[in-house]
């Protein structure tokens, strides 16, 4: 297992929506084919796994298990959206990314990135 | 009506192993994550573990990680929970439970999960 760099925002705001989106970039010491990155979360003495995707290079990302994220691919960089997020979901989200193929295996962890979700107020009765 | 059955629960001493298993019933069991509470006498219930619908993502505990695993064999409507490393404060009444809506959430939290079963018990003594 060899270590590889991995660089993301240090803070990122949610929306009023509950949607937050930040870039992971990795630097790729080779051509790597299939890359498989996740995300974890880090906060409330809990450490999850909020989703996971292998894709080929140059590929969409597809997430499995009804995930909270969507996310695209571009050359070194991963475009992640984490949605449907609340303000208990607010922590720390740490990218990982694992070069499968081909050999040899890459690792690299994010310092990962204060994901920030304040629920929205909801809206006062109007006589309009 | 998912009804969850949790055994494997005993008494070992610290630093042994056990797998505790959840036995489900249901048609809707594989589309839902589930997880593991646990309750110490005189403490609060507490979160222990969850894993996804299809047992492809995890949850942990910051005091279980890299001592417990979680995992489902969906085959068998079963969902365990490997403990390894135990310690005397791992001893308490352990629960298995389904959370309230399909889908995987960032955060795991106790309220968030329903159809908890009966519990098993498991004891570690030093």
């Known amino acids: 297992c060899k270590a590889m760099h991995v660089a993301q925002p240090a803070v990122v705001l949610a929306s009023s929506r509950g949607i937050a989106s930040f870039v992971c970039e990795y630097a790729s010491p080779g051509k790597a084919t299939e890359v498989r990155v996740t995300v974890l979360r880090q906060a409330d003495s809990q450490v999850t796994e909020v989703c996971a995707a292998t894709y080929m290079m140059g590929n969409e990302l597809t997430f499995l298990d009804d995930s909270i994220c969507t996310g695209t691919s571009s050359g070194n960089q991963v475009n992640l959206t984490i949605q449907g997020l609340r303000a208990m979901d607010t922590g720390l989200y740490i990218c990982k990314v694992e070069l499968m193929y081909p050999p040899p295996y890459y690792l690299g962890i994010g310092n990962g990135t204060q994901i920030y979700v304040i629920d929205p107020e909801p809206c006062p009765d109007s006589d309009f | 009506e998912v009804q969850l059955v949790e055994s494997g629960g005993q008494l070992v001493q610290a630093g042994g192993s056990l797998r505790l298993s959840c036995a489900a019933t249901?048609?809707?069991?594989?589309?839902?994550?589930l997880g593991w509470s646990r309750q110490a006498p005189g403490k609060e219930r507490e979160f222990v573990a969850a894993i996804s619908a299809s047992g492809t993502l995890r949850a942990y505990a910051d005091s279980v990680k890299g001592r417990f695993t979680i995992s489902r064999d969906n085959a068998k409507n079963t969902v365990y929970l490997q403990m390894n490393s135990l310690k005397p404060e791992d001893t308490a009444v352990y629960y298995c439970?389904?959370?309230?809506?399909?889908?995987?959430?960032?955060?795991?939290?106790?309220?968030?999960?329903?159809?908890w079963g009966q519990g098993t018990q498991v004891t570690v003594s030093s």
């Open positions: 249901g048609r809707t069991y594989n589309s839902y994550s």
């Open positions: 439970g389904r959370h309230r809506s399909v889908g995987w959430r960032a955060s795991h939290h106790l309220s968030d999960y329903d159809n």
